[in-house]
Interface confidence: low
């Protein structure tokens, strides 16, 4: 229904705390360089204004759209052009073009320092002094580094953060209580970020239809007892929620997500028998829980898929009469039978089925033509299954760090023109798939591996779009989202690449590496590994292993030496010489 004042409506629906959190996230995602204090001031002004509209919906400006109100606030910021350059040009436009312009200027890789966690005592002190400000800082710092983070989910992670601090700051050993718990939240939040970015990419590049197809497949896997009409309703609602969040309409997004959670809990009987535990929780936890709820038990009596989609005499007639609905029912029926497949694979199968019907229904004898379609799925299914087996075997043999290094070598050979920091970040993220997925039961591995890899490769594509340097990467990133992962997997050594000349300074290290945390040490070593491959793209695995073992030995020796600086300055050049010889 239409409301006289949109801002009053959202304030009433969401409540002050969530309203303020979401406005802070919105501003931080649009203007990523502003300080917390600058944004907090704007948030307070917007909240005060919303309260006047709640008191009197007819008050001045209360009837304006949220984009107009928020955009006007952002455009009133002093020194906008000095700090944000051409983003300031957005302010010369009218809505809705102004908001579109802001969206286009979101930076997926802002030049901000890494979000460092203060030490436990300091963190607890500032949390106890002012929990609201502390959580505000958290929302601001995460949102500006992840401009497409799913806003209602970020409120959930902030709530988790709050609960952990409340518990651990009361303990004697705060550090050992906080570290593992906060590490866990950070890991989950980072995965959530890349997954949501993938959804927004799908929406931005291929539109709502593509996202809705993704949602139908995902929901059908999770809720195999729900009928097609129910799945379609949920997919439509979920598409709306995600469209709003990806479009910066965070208040509407959070409000509609809460509505969807409410609907699911009130209609459990027609959706799934697994929802009750989620539905007993408060709002943020409930919506989060529903988003990752376990798959319902598959109905025992499902007929073979061939009956309706291959053997039925009316296949071409049904397809011609309502293409999207018929393909939707195919995707629904196939997905509910295959919780063990990735969504990407299910969408590739649906695409193959569509292409087959397009071709065959125009022929003289369609059934003879499309009769083998299910058999033609086989290679499409085998390819990701082999990928999972090969990579999980390798992960089990090498462990996470070794597996990351294997991927780093592989991807540097595929796209040596890509910057080393991007390659290292991608390989580290891709390598985490082992820890995340290879330990799962067999039937959960494939969906976990492929859908996670797809999300990470989406980030590679986004970073590459800013500065395109590799034709290989451009080729894989230009196709459809579901074809990206197979495209990257199929890439081989880039034969067009002219190897980098050997620069001794790239492989020169100093004693400061010894005091770095383990993660930072790994990144330094992986940077050197990528540079080695760029120097010798056709180096064998053996050669690279020899060099990296030598390098690890060198670091170990010099970091244990009494005079570290002397060790690094004398042994370093020897290492460089040995490396050159080993790779000659």
């Amino acid at each position: 229904e239409a409301h006289k004042s949109e801002i009053a409506h959202r304030y009433n629906d969401l409540g002050e705390q969530h309203f303020k959190g979401l406005v802070l996230i919105a501003f931080s995602q649009y203007l990523q360089k502003c300080s917390y204090d600058e944004h907090a001031k704007l948030v307070q002004e917007v909240t005060d204004f919303a309260k006047t509209c709640v008191a009197d919906e007819s008050a001045a400006n209360c009837d304006k759209s949220l984009h107009t109100l928020f955009g006007d606030k952002l455009c009133a910021i002093p020194n906008l052009r000095e700090n944000y350059g051409e983003l300031a040009d957005c302010c010369t436009k009218q809505e809705p073009e102004r908001n579109e312009c802001f969206l286009q200027h979101k930076d997926d890789n802002p030049s901000l320092p890494p979000f460092e966690r203060p030490e436990a005592e300091a963190m607890c002190t500032s949390f106890k002094e002012n929990p609201t400000t502390f959580m505000g800082h958290y929302l601001h710092e995460v949102a500006r580094r992840h401009p497409y983070f799913y806003a209602p989910e970020l409120l959930y992670y902030a709530e988790q953060y709050n609960e952990i601090l409340t518990q651990c700051c009361a303990e004697a050993d705060k550090e050992s209580c906080l570290t593992p718990k906060l590490d866990g939240v950070k890991e989950k939040a980072l995965v959530s970020s890349v997954r949501q970015r993938m959804k927004c990419s799908s929406m931005q590049k291929f539109g709502e239809r593509a996202f809705k197809a993704w949602a139908v497949a995902r929901l059908s896997q999770t809720f195999p007892n729900a009928d097609f009409a129910e799945i379609t309703k949920l997919a439509t609602d979920l598409t709306k929620v995600n469209k709003e969040c990806c479009h910066g309409d965070l208040l509407e997004c959070a409000d509609d997500r809460a509505e969807l959670a409410k609907y699911m809990c009130e209609n459990q009987a027609t959706i799934s028998s697994k929802l009750q535990t989620c539905c007993d929780k408060p709002l943020l936890k409930k919506a989060h829980c529903l988003s990752e709820v376990e798959h319902d038990t598959m109905p025992a009596d499902l007929p073979a898929i061939a009956a309706d989609f291959v053997e039925d005499q009316e296949v071409c007639k049904n397809y011609a009469e309502a293409k999207d609905v018929f393909l939707g029912t195919f995707l629904y029926e196939y997905s509910r039978r295959h919780p063990d497949y990735s969504v990407s694979l299910l969408l590739r199968l649906a695409k193959k089925y569509e292409a087959t019907l397009e071709k065959c229904c125009a022929e003289a004898n369609p059934p003879a033509c499309y009769g083998t379609v299910l058999a033609e799925f086989q290679p499409l299914v085998e390819e990701p299954k082999n990928l999972v087996k090969t990579n999980c075997d390798l992960y089990e043999k090498l462990g996470e760090y070794g597996f990351q290094n294997a991927i780093l070598v592989r991807y540097t050979q595929k796209a040596p023109q890509v910057s080393t920091p991007t390659l290292v970040e991608a390989a580290r993220n891709l390598g985490r798939v082992g820890t995340k997925c290879c330990t799962l039961p067999e039937d959960q591995r494939l969906p976990c591996v492929e859908d996670y890899l797809s999300a990470i490769l989406n980030r590679v594509c986004l970073l590459h779009e800013k500065t395109p340097v590799s034709e290989h990467v451009t080729k894989c990133c230009s196709g459809s989202l579901v074809e990206r992962r197979p495209c990257f997997s199929a890439l081989t050594v880039d034969e067009t690449y002219v190897p980098k000349e050997f620069k001794a300074e790239t492989f020169t290290f100093h004693s400061d590496i010894c005091t770095l945390p383990e993660k930072e040490k790994q990144i330094k070593k992986q940077t050197a590994l990528a540079e080695l491959v760029k120097h010798k793209p056709k180096a064998t695995a053996e050669q690279l292993k020899t060099v990296m073992d030598d390098f690890a030995q060198f670091l170990d020796t010099c970091c244990k030496a009494a005079d570290k600086d002397t060790c690094f300055s004398t042994e370093g050049p020897n290492l460089v010489t040995r490396c050159k010889d080993a790779l000659a």
């Epitope: 007892n225 809990c265 009130e266 459990q268 009987a269 027609t270 028998s273 929802l275 009750q276 539905c279 007993d280 038990t297």
Partner: nanobody, 115 residues
């Protein structure tokens, strides 16, 4: 279409007994936990009792503990509430719900305890 149909209510004297039934259709009854909820005149809904999908785990509000017994027959797709030692404050419309929901999806059955 999910349907829940309660029956068995009526007028009973304090200390008396009644057994309510709830016939379910339109969903896989045996997969869901169920509850009984009641609403007294002028008051909000109050959760009374719950039972898990298999019937093994039962829960009761403090106000009815020891007097009411919830049970189910999955083959008949029916939920029951055996009410003993009824008190005037048990007067309400009783309805069954899926899970622990207290939102009404049916008409309910009136129980009046009065002398």
């Amino acid at each position: 279409q999910v349907q829940l149909q309660e029956s068995g209510g009526g007028l009973v004297q304090p200390g008396g007994s009644l057994t309510l039934s709830c016939a379910a259709s339109g969903f896989t009854f045996g997969s869901f936990g169920m509850s009984w909820v009641r609403q007294a005149p002028g008051k909000g809904p109050e959760w009374v009792s719950a039972i898990d999908s298999s019937g093994a785990d039962t829960r009761y509000a403090d106000s009815v503990k020891g007097r009411f017994t919830i049970s189910r027959d999955n083959a008949k797709k029916t939920l029951y509430l055996q009410m003993n030692s009824l008190k005037p404050e048990d007067t309400a419309v009783y309805y069954c719900t899926i899970g622990r929901s207290t939102s009404r999806g049916s008409q309910g059955t009136q129980v009046t305890v009065s002398s």
